[in-house]
Interface confidence: medium
């Protein structure tokens, strides 16, 4: 792929090469959609995608989820996946702008954090904003989960999977009313288990951008287009939490 | 059994007022983003208006956006519908709808509004 | 919130197949967004057919089947019987949180 700089990127932003983002990163599509075989965010190995065999569940609520959408859709009618990762409490209602001042960073002070950790993003994400998650992915490790959440919808769900059919694969997709929508898969997998880690995701008007370790990773188009309503990053996973913060770039 | 029965449709003049209810069973109604569609008479199905299982998000169709407002009672196991400034062309039967992101799977049997003079 | 294109109406003979499609944009339909089918007999209200482009609730006939590609969202009838002479309806959300019908095409069984 075409590599650009940040400063292409954002030319005319008068920060030509802003703290913290990779100089330079793959001018890549978002990733193909699902296939056959492909597992829901949270499932467990072995779960297959709507279309992929006849008779197949498709993705559903997850059952236990905590906040306003505990529940399975109806019986016979939106069969669930067997687990997942429940919902984030719901946060305050999001204000109406995303005015964020390009200072910072705002967020988790540096020390180890409690995982599942939420970091609350009050005026939603805008573009240019940077979010930077430090941490280290625990031995033995099985997921990581971001969970860029609006309300009990997931905006952006990146999801590292450490072991799906003994392979290593991340799973990005989208929550909305109660339901999975169609995943985007990458295959190439920057994390090691008992490793550090950084992961950097920038908001972009149309996409968001991940970085992992200075390198780009990928990038998934906003399906969730009310950027101002995505008021919560929540943060689980087999990872040791550093910190959590955000910036404008 | 799953049921919606919609209720408070009639005849109304021109830049009046209507209070639509639907009255939800068989389900845990706060878990469920609810919807309004109408139909008008002899014509296709048009989204109204959507509310999230908590209320927090609220959305609209541009034909509707400033003179409808819906809302929910999770208590009461209703979904509400206050329509104002209503024109002739908001004529149409009005079904309430149980949502998900892959289909909306139970639909009330519908109310009819009539705005005429 | 343009509504999504169908053809205004399709006929088919008993034991025939049939096909209605369903074009939208890449913010409804192409955007990684579901398309769902409804079923309406005149006089009652709208029945979920296929659910997340391709999926049949329980109780719909296999008869009935959806898939997608690109913008176009299609939906296959096989076996055609006189019981499902309808209105059929196409609906995809969109990424304004909002949700788009087709303008319906109506089923004529010969």
């Known amino acids: 792929a075409d590599n650009f700089s940040l400063h292409d990127a954002l030319s005319g932003s008068g920060n030509p090469n802003p703290q913290g983002w990779p100089g330079a990163w793959g001018n890549q599509p978002a990733g193909a959609g699902g296939y056959p075989g492909a597992s829901y965010p949270g499932a467990y190995p072995g779960q297959a995608p709507p279309g992929a065999y006849p008779g197949q569940a498709p993705p559903g609520a997850y059952p236990g989820a905590p906040g306003a959408y505990p529940g399975a859709p109806a019986p016979g009618v939106y069969p669930g996946p067997p687990s997942g990762p429940g919902a984030y409490p719901s946060s305050g209602q999001p204000s109406a702008t995303g005015a964020y001042p390009a200072t910072g960073p705002y967020g988790a002070p540096a020390g180890p954090l409690i995982v599942p950790y939420n970091l609350p993003l009050p005026g939603g994400v805008v573009p240019r904003m940077l979010i930077t998650i430090l941490g280290t992915v625990k031995p033995n490790a099985n997921r990581i989960a971001l969970d860029f959440q609006r309300g009990n919808d997931v905006a952006f769900h990146f999801n590292p999977r450490f072991n799906e059919n003994n392979r290593r694969v991340i799973v990005c997709n989208t929550k909305l009313d109660n339901n999975w929508g169609r995943e985007e898969r990458q295959s190439v997998f920057p994390f090691e288990s008992g490793k550090p880690f950084k992961i950097q995701v920038l908001v972009e008007p149309d996409h968001f951008k991940v970085a992992v370790n200075d390198a780009h990773l990928l990038q998934y188009n906003h399906r969730v287009k009310k950027l101002n309503e995505i008021s919560k990053l929540g943060i689980s996973g087999d990872i040791d939490l550093t910190s959590a913060s955000y910036t404008m770039i | 059994e799953v049921q919606l029965v919609e209720s408070g449709g009639g005849l109304v003049k021109p830049g009046g007022s209507l209070r639509l209810s639907c009255a939800a069973s068989?389900?845990?109604?706060?878990?469920?983003?609810m919807n309004w569609v109408r139909q008008a008479p002899g014509k296709g199905l048009e989204w109204v208006s959507s509310?999230?299982?908590?209320?927090?998000?609220?959305y609209y169709a541009d034909s509707v956006k400033g003179r409808f407002t819906i809302s929910r009672d999770n208590a009461k196991n209703s979904l509400y519908l206050q329509m104002n400034s209503l024109r002739a062309e908001d004529t149409a039967v009005y079904y309430c709808v149980r949502s998900s992101y892959g289909g909306m799977d139970v639909w009330g049997r519908g109310t009819l509004v009539t705005v005429s003079s | 919130q343009s509504a999504l294109t169908q053809p205004a109406s399709v006929s088919g003979s008993p034991g025939q197949s049939i096909t209605i499609s369903c074009t939208g944009t890449?913010?409804?339909?192409?955007?990684?967004?579901?398309v769902a089918w409804y079923q309406q007999h005149p006089g009652k209200a709208p029945k979920l057919m296929i659910y997340?482009?391709?999926y049949r609730p329980s109780g719909v006939s296999n008869r009935f089947s959806g898939s997608k590609s690109g913008n176009t969202a299609s939906l296959t009838i096989s076996g055609l019987q006189a019981e499902d002479e309808a209105d059929y309806y196409c609906?995809?959300?969109?990424?304004?949180?909002?949700?788009?019908f087709g303008g319906g095409t109506k089923l004529e069984i010969k």
């Open positions: 609906s995809s959300y969109t990424g304004y949180s909002t949700r788009v």
């Open positions: 068989g389900f845990t109604f706060s878990n469920y983003n």
């Open positions: 509310i999230y299982g908590s209320s927090r998000y609220i």
């Open positions: 890449s913010s409804d339909v192409g955007g990684s967004y579901n």
């Open positions: 997340y482009d391709s």
